[in-house]
């Protein structure tokens, strides 16, 4: 039950995380104009991964796409790539994890297969989350560097009374969405990996069990018991029948009541 809950919760958390990564990637507010020097600006600038926008006090907003690929900074391209890789991996992970969910029956899929799929999706979610966090962090670092560079050159042409104020950019909402979403995807992935451990069946459930009757001895192997009942509680090599069943190692030292008639 705990395994199912962990797996289900991991799936939901990852789903929310990946939706957040997609939202962050599409958002225009990766960087927003710093209003420290002019809190009542009549023209507000903000930029995303795909386009830059200007919102005027009049209410009009104009957005322009970056219609060049070669002219863009390498860092921006890297951030785009990281976010897209994160989305792709996350989407594949979601697809895999749907089939891996314990609560969903697909044909006669064994627990071992579901465990493998859960682990695969978990790893994909972890990498997806890391890609998103890395992408957002690279962009944030780029902003911080540019912010202090433009602060140093805040006013150019101060020889006369004319001032040219450089626009500085600070963290936009998309960065925070990206960090949170990446974190959620990462957590979801870890939960899936934890769930995988609970799903994985033991390699050898039980050793052969010997039954010694008076006339002849017959060996039984009730290794299929756990699988046939459909319950996953007996994962250790426990003795199932206390009446007369013993492992082969125990037979010599402990006589059974069936040895003497």
């Amino acid at each position: 039950m705990a395994v199912t809950a962990c797996q289900g919760l991991g799936f939901v958390v990852s789903l929310i995380g990946i939706a957040g990564i997609i939202a962050a990637t599409c958002m225009d507010q990766w960087s927003t104009q710093d209003l420290y020097n002019n809190p009542v600006t009549a023209v507000f600038n903000y930029q995303g991964l795909w386009r830059s926008c200007v919102r005027e006090s009049s209410g009009f907003t104009e957005c322009r796409g970056y219609f060049t690929l070669l002219g863009l900074p390498a860092m921006l391209q890297a951030v785009r790539a990281l976010m897209i890789v994160g989305i792709v991996l996350g989407a594949i992970g979601l697809l895999v994890s749907i089939f891996a969910l314990k609560c969903i029956r697909i044909g006669s899929m064994e627990d071992s297969a579901k465990a493998n799929m859960t682990l695969t999706s978990g790893i994909m979610f972890i990498v997806s989350g890391l890609c998103a966090i890395a992408g957002v962090s690279v962009f944030a670092n780029m902003l911080v560097t540019n912010f202090w560079m433009s602060t140093a050159n805040m006013y150019t042409g101060m020889g006369g009374m004319v001032q040219t104020v450089q626009t500085r950019y600070t963290f936009g909402a998309a960065l925070f969405v990206g960090w949170v979403a990446g974190g959620l995807t990462l957590i979801g992935g870890v939960m899936m990996c934890i769930a995988c451990r609970g799903l994985a069946p033991e390699e050898t459930n039980y050793k052969a069990v010997s039954y010694h009757a008076s006339g002849h001895s017959v060996a039984y192997k009730p290794g299929g018991f756990k699988a046939s009942t459909g319950f996953g509680s007996n994962t250790k090599n426990k003795k199932i029948y206390d009446g007369g069943a013993r492992t082969e190692d125990e037979v010599q030292s402990y006589p059974s009541k069936h040895d003497y008639v």
Epitope: V40, T41, E56, S57, G59, E62, T164
Partner: antibody, heavy 118, light 113 residues
């Protein structure tokens, strides 16, 4: 044709109050940020206040801050300017204007005269 | 606050001649986000409210005759009337539309010589 019609002007004593109204027609009033601009007799234009389309933001110059309040009722397509603690230097023709692209004052009313005198 | 300085204060030009009005701002009106200059020109005829002529320093408002043109960038701007008509007699104002408080130039009175 877009129409902006100001009303509420008149003679008022220094320290008194007045409320100007601007009724808009023939355009989507709720989509536009609106401003008040005044012009003292024989003088140039002076911006007085601006309100965003969603009523969330208001802006004033230091000369009227704390004394004037701009507001709007989108349901009634009406813009208001509440003027308190009026001074002689507030005497002017008050125009309401609708802001368009480039924050330009695209639509103008005919103006209403406010005279502050004892 | 951004100070807008217009020159000349008054200008007399013959009909059919070119009229040029200058406007200088104390700070750049160029927005780096869209590379547009937030300078607006208005025309005010006697007894009438102002009328929008040009926004973004060079974009003509619809319905404005093409003899009116705006140019300039950063801090220096110009309004040009290529061929003066009798109906162009008015006072012309430039305005900072880039940051609050919005400020107007002192105005240039255009007359016929």
């Amino acid at each position: 044709e877009v129409q902006l019609l100001e009303s509420g002007g008149g003679l008022v004593q220094p320290g008194g109050s007045l409320r100007l109204s601007c009724a808009a027609s023939e355009f989507t009033f709720s989509n536009y940020a609106m401003s008040w601009v005044r012009q003292a007799p024989g003088k140039g234009l002076e911006w007085v206040a601006t309100i965003s389309s969603g009523r969330s933001s208001t802006y004033y110059p230091d000369s009227v801050k704390g004394r004037f309040t701009i507001s709007r009722d989108n349901a009634k397509n009406t813009l208001y300017l509440q003027m308190n603690s009026l001074r002689a230097e507030d005497t002017a023709v008050y125009y309401c204007a609708g802001l368009g692209r480039g924050n330009a004052m695209e639509y103008w009313g005919q103006g209403t005269l406010v005279t502050v005198s004892s | 606050d951004i100070v807008m300085t217009q020159s000349p204060d008054s200008l007399a030009v013959s009909l059919g001649e070119r009229a040029t009005i200058n406007c200088k701002s104390s700070q750049s009106l160029l927005n780096s986000g869209n590379q547009k200059n937030y300078l607006t020109w208005y025309q005010q005829k006697p007894g009438q409210p102002p009328k929008l002529l040009i926004y973004w320093a060079s974009t003509r408002e619809s319905g404005v005759p093409d003899r009116f043109s705006g140019s300039g960038s950063g801090t220096d701007f110009t309004l040009t009337i290529s061929s003066l008509q009798a109906e162009d007699v008015a006072v012309y104002y430039c305005q900072n539309a880039y940051s609050y408080p919005f400020t107007f130039g002192g105005g240039t009175k255009l007359e016929i010589k």
